[in-house]
């Protein structure tokens, strides 16, 4: 027989020879990092037809690293489901917990012993420091010093000293999230008051009021023969300005032809749609009609148009 077969997990005992006699036996031993579990044979014999009798290294098992328990509130996941050297152990924490230590450990061979590359990590509960205090407002659980994962606080504004209330700008509720960070920035409390929105040649159709605070919403339509330049709906934003800006009602210009169109009702378009006539050349109207005196509307002299401090 020629040289005996070679294996990944076991090696020949002694030096190989160029050829072997029929009936001659060779013995193997498990390589470093492998150990023998009976009863499979680890030897072979040169048989009559000059071939080696079947033998395998199935009796040699790879050294395994020590078993790693799941960390409390987490999981140890062996890559490929094995603890054998050459493989990794991954660690993950349950929701609401974070990892302290190595996320991956490696099963390494030191001499003939398989050991992990480090100490297994631990899973610690996600905790948040108290959320920020805000000017002119407060939050629930203000006496609590440590917040756990998903604990929530709700902000509210203090009563205002003047005639106009504080408005809460932003989300009122925030929660302790991953990485021990609050889910969003704290809101703010401030007086938000928008000027009375006046649209010449138009009228307000909803959102009537004497004062317009944060998030007040107003809708308009134009008088007959005028079209809306801008949005028909505006909202009082946190900067005490209307968003989008207060629209204008512009006169519908007759087409270039001699015959003007018959208009039987007012034309109201959205901010993205303009009347075809709006692009016509010619001077813009300069006539200013008197301020409308619709029921429920305050007159300008009532002070609503005064600038805000």
């Amino acid at each position: 027989c020629e040289e005996p077969p070679t294996f990944e997990a076991m090696e020949l005992i002694g030096k190989p020879k160029p050829y072997y006699e029929i009936g001659e036996r060779v013995d193997y031993k498990c390589k470093k990092g492998y150990f023998y579990i009976p009863p499979l044979a680890t030897h072979t014999i040169c048989d009559r037809n000059h071939t080696w009798l079947p033998v395998s290294d199935d009796a040699c098992y790879r050294e395994t690293c020590p078993y790693i328990r799941d960390p409390l509130n987490g999981q140890a996941v062996p890559a490929n489901g094995t603890y054998e050297f050459g493989y990794q152990m991954h660690f993950i924490c349950n929701e609401g917990y974070y990892l302290i230590g190595e996320e991956i450990l490696y099963c390494e061979l030191k001499g003939s012993v398989a050991i992990w590359s480090g100490k297994p990590p631990i899973c610690e509960k996600v905790l948040c420091t108290p959320p920020p205090k805000i000017k002119n407002g407060k939050h629930t659980f203000s006496e609590v010093e440590v917040f756990e994962y998903l604990d929530a606080v709700t902000y509210s504004c203090d009563p205002a000293p003047g005639p106009d209330p504080f408005s809460l700008i932003g989300e009122s509720t925030i929660y302790c999230g991953d990485n021990s960070v609050w889910s969003r920035a704290a809101p703010e409390c401030k007086v938000v008051k928008c000027r009375f929105p006046v649209v010449e040649n138009g009228k307000q159709i909803s959102g009537f009021g004497k004062k317009f605070y944060y998030k007040a919403t107003v809708m308009f339509e134009c008088d007959k023969g005028f079209y809306l330049d801008g949005s028909d709906t505006i909202v009082c934003d946190s900067n005490s300005t209307w968003d989008p800006p207060v629209p204008k009602c512009l006169k519908v210009l007759p087409p270039s032809s001699t015959k003007p169109p018959a208009l039987s009702h007012s034309v109201s378009t959205s901010s993205t749609t303009k009347s075809p006539a709006s692009s016509a050349s010619g001077p813009r109207p300069t006539y200013k009609p008197p301020v409308s005196n619709y029921p429920g509307y305050p007159k300008p002299e009532e002070g609503i148009l005064d600038s805000l401090d």
């Epitope: 395994t64 020590p66 078993y67 790693i68 328990r69 799941d70 960390p71 999981q75 100490k119 631990i122």
Partner: antibody, heavy 120, light 110 residues
């Protein structure tokens, strides 16, 4: 009081399968792991495998891989071990035991055992 | 492999008893714990935990039971044997896969 209640004795024919149950009470089922052990008549104890009820993840003794399948039903706090292709070699008492999770965990409470007899 | 000795331990009530357990591999884990426990199986009963992590007595276990050792060599001692202590004692390692029990030591009356 922590208790692990196992099914009563089983008599099954060779080649058949059997499913042994272990109902846990008195503690949070998903906060522990469950270990299964075989004890053949008059012999020592053999570890079959563990299951983590929180994840359903299992670790087996290679000797029992393919023979035993470990599962859990979290809603009823019950662990199961199915043994298939039964032979007389599988006749034994089978125990479940609760293991504390985390580093430094150990197996503190055991079921009363289920006697399995495989005979035609 | 866990090698327990002796296989049988005849004692008189009140005597001290000592059981040895040797492992082929160190049972010290990289997490800092040594995973060696002792169980007693009384006749017709399930195994019951006596000692965990080498030397910690489980709740309700009398202080006459003590465990010691490190690495690969461990010992269970019973300072004064009582009748209720009779049964088979097993050491158990859960540091390496597969987890293994010792062959057992039968504590019996002389």
């Amino acid at each position: 009081e922590i208790q692990l209640q196992q099914t009563g004795p089983e008599l099954v024919k060779p080649g058949a399968s059997v499913k042994i149950s272990c109902k846990a009470s008195g503690y949070s089922f998903t906060d522990s792991i469950m270990l299964w052990v075989k004890q053949s008549h008059g012999k020592s104890l053999e570890w079959i495998g563990n299951i983590n009820p929180y994840y359903g993840s299992t670790t087996y003794n290679l000797k029992f891989k393919g023979k035993a399948t470990l599962t859990v039903d979290k809603s009823s706090s019950t662990a199961y071990m199915q043994l298939n292709s039964l032979t007389s070699e599988d006749s034994a008492v089978y125990y479940c035991a609760r293991g504390l999770r985390g580093y430094g965990g150990y197996f503190d409470y055991w079921g009363q055992g289920t006697t399995l007899t495989v005979s035609s | 492999v866990m090698t327990q000795s002796p296989l049988s331990l005849p004692v008189n009530i009140g005597d001290q008893a000592s059981i040895s357990c040797k492992s082929t591999k160190s049972l010290l884990n990289s997490d800092g714990f040594t995973y060696l426990d002792w169980y007693l199986q009384k006749p017709g009963q399930s195994p019951q935990l006596l000692i965990y992590l080498v030397s910690n007595r489980f709740s309700g276990v009398p202080d006459r039971f003590s465990g010691s050792g490190s690495g690969t060599d461990f010992t269970l001692k019973i300072s004064r044997v009582e009748a209720e202590d009779l049964g088979v004692y097993y050491c158990f390692q859960s540091n390496s896969l597969p987890f293994t029990f010792g062959s057992g030591t039968k504590l019996e009356i002389k």
